[in-house]
Interface confidence: medium
């Protein structure tokens, strides 16, 4: 049993069938002696009496939070919430393994800049009881600081017959360094909590590993005299980290037809402008990607051709 | 450079990105493989890092480059070492056309730009670790690799940097 | 858009009790937690206790420890506080406030909550 937090607790227990759980001692934090029972959640039962209560949690009827009290007052609560073992391994019943990069991710970060700022967002299909803390710093033996905003529930989609929620978190590192080589990476440890149910789900990573810039912007075509050529030219993103001439990124560009089967042919750039066939009902899109370290491509940005 | 000459910022922003190139092909997937384990934050030490007070940031680099490009020829002379060392010449043998060859020869050369005949900056000693076991050599080979990826694309934001507002 | 509407605030003499009530308007509260908190002219608003919705478990601040209670009726869909062996230093203006979903287990601080009430007048003569 560990604290989570002053007053709330965690039990881990190994989950198996006649599993014979944990034996746990709660002690009222009250200096009065005589006189105090224990009662469990809002039921009236009196549990037992004594500044201390021993039981034996083996399910999730037996977490919850324990009261004791004297004389009809309330004098302290603890909170119990488990934490299961199966077969050795933590449960990750509460987010949905989002499978990419790899099988068991469930938290997934991005960046757009290397400014020590980066969002994480992960997914689960339930809708009540969900609670979330998120803790994150670089490096795990000797931790620097790292500062998460609140989690907000940033989208919902109904996926068949499930609805899916997905919750994000904003975090930025203390002293981020841009222009220095990561040497320790990013942890990013979320707290879940379902009901009495309590799940810890974790993520390591490098920021210049999860880098995905916005879309170029301000793409702009202009058809050139006596030729079946535009030129087309477009910015580098707001959010992209600055100078340009230090922070660079490289860019693909295609030509892609009305119809989906149409050849696209794919050209790399490191300019912000190049002289392309636009033709009539295609459409021209650029990606952006950072020029020195193959982290993923931005999103496309496109434009009509015609 | 040494002595406080200025490099000859267009070639080495050149052979950077070049090297930028030949570090991802020398090993595409890298990028996708979880190679941190337990008791890496320590091992990560043992390499050369362009470090936050190195000077090779926007600002520091306008000051004086000498620091930046001090660390970076130390760190290019470090990683040429282990690449013409046991861990990659050894069991398991590279294939034939691999870029390794090539990314070799172009840390050697980056790093003779920035210090050009008759100059001898002092160099840090090079740990020379010889696993035993081919797995071993394979898994240390793309951690190198992996921290070498890391390190070329901070040179390569100096050295593009400095070609575009510090050349004479 | 939800709406917090607090009432039962009033004088009361040291020693005596308070109940106080906070009914959300505008949306189901399944699933949140609903927090109240105090403020004093002059200084920052500050935690006094929270109830999560769903299961009814309270936290509170030492300062008021084993004096108030929080509790909820979910058929009236209402939060109260009640308040007993009361003080002085008791007297603010308290505020109840909610979030949906709640981002921390016990949200205790200001920016963890997304609506607030307008305000009750406590005030504690000796």
């Known amino acids: 049993i560990w604290e989570l937090k002053k007053d709330v607790y965690v039990v881990e227990l190994d989950w198996y069938p006649d599993a014979p759980g944990e034996m746990v001692v709660l002690t009222c934090d009250t200096p009065e002696e005589d006189g105090i029972t224990w009662t469990l959640d809002q039921s009236g039962e009196v549990l037992g009496s004594g500044k201390t209560l021993t039981i034996q949690v083996k399910e999730f009827g037996d977490a919850g939070q324990y009261t004791c009290h004297k004389g009809g007052e309330a004098l302290s609560h603890s909170l119990l919430l488990l934490h299961k073992k199966e077969d050795g391994i933590w449960s990750t019943d509460v987010l949905k393994d989002q499978k990419e990069p790899k099988n068991k991710t469930f938290l997934r970060c991005e960046a757009k800049n290397y400014s020590g700022r980066f969002t994480c967002w992960w997914l689960t299909t339930i809708s009540t009881d969900l609670t979330f803390s998120v803790k994150s710093s670089r490096g795990s033996s000797n931790p620097q600081g790292v500062t998460c905003g609140a989690v907000t529930l940033s989208a919902e989609r109904v996926r068949g017959d499930n609805k899916e929620y997905e919750y994000s978190v904003e975090c930025q590192e203390d002293s981020a360094c841009p222009a220095a080589e990561e040497r320790l990476p990013i942890e990013v440890m979320v707290d879940a909590i379902h009901k009495l149910k309590y799940e810890n789900y974790t993520s390591s990573f490098f920021i210049r590993d999860i880098i995905k810039p916005d879309p170029p912007k301000n793409l702009q075509l202009k058809p050139l005299k006596n030729s079946r050529q535009v030129e087309v030219s477009w910015e580098y993103p707001d959010t992209w980290s600055t100078p340009h001439s230090y922070f660079s990124l490289t860019f693909c560009i295609q030509v892609q037809g009305k119809s989906k089967r149409e050849k696209k042919d794919r050209i790399f750039t490191d300019k912000t402008s190049a002289t392309v066939i636009c033709r009539k009902n295609a459409s021209f899109s650029v990606q952006a990607q950072d020029r020195y370290y193959s982290s993923s491509w931005s999103e496309w940005a496109s434009v009509p051709c015609s | 450079v040494p002595g406080g000459s200025s490099p000859a910022w267009a070639q080495c922003q050149q052979l950077s990105q070049k090297l930028c190139t030949l570090a991802w092909s020398a090993h595409p997937l890298v990028g996708h493989m979880d190679l941190r384990e337990e008791g890496d934050e320590e091992t990560t030490n043992d390499v050369p890092h362009i470090q936050c007070g190195d000077g090779c940031d926007p600002q520091g680099l306008r000051d004086n480059s000498q620091f930046c490009l001090q660390r970076i020829r130390q760190g290019l002379i470090f990683y040429e070492k282990l690449l013409g060392s046991d861990i990659f010449t050894g069991e398991p043998s590279l294939l034939p056309d691999s870029p390794v060859g090539q990314l070799h020869a172009s840390l050697l050369g980056l790093s003779q730009l920035l210090q050009p005949e008759g100059h001898h900056w002092e160099t840090q000693q090079i740990p020379s670790p010889s696993p035993s076991q081919p797995w071993q050599r394979l898994l240390l080979r793309f951690k190198i690799l992996r921290s070498l990826q890391a390190f070329v694309a901070v040179a390569a934001r100096v050295f593009a940097h400095g070609a575009a507002t510090l050349s004479p | 858009e939800v709406q917090l509407v607090e009432s039962g605030g009033g004088l009361a003499q040291a020693g005596g009790s308070l109940r106080l009530s906070c009914a959300p308007s505008?949306?189901?509260?399944?699933?949140?937690?609903m927090g109240w908190f105090r403020q004093v002219p002059g200084k920052e608003r500050e935690f006094v206790g929270v109830?999560?919705?769903?299961?009814?478990?309270?936290y509170y601040a030492d300062s008021v420890k084993g004096r108030f209670t929080i509790s909820r009726d979910s058929a009236k869909n209402t939060v109260y506080l009640q308040m007993d062996s009361l003080k002085p230093e008791d007297t603010a203006v308290y505020y109840c406030?909610?979030?949906?979903?709640?981002?921390?287990?016990?949200?205790?601080?200001?920016?963890?909550?997304?609506?607030w009430g307008q305000g009750t007048q406590v005030t504690v003569s000796s």
């Open positions: 406030a909610a979030r949906t979903p709640n981002s921390s287990w016990f949200p205790t601080t200001l920016y963890e909550y997304d609506y």
């Open positions: 505008g949306r189901a509260f399944s699933g949140s937690a």
């Open positions: 109830i999560i919705w769903t299961g009814g478990y309270t």
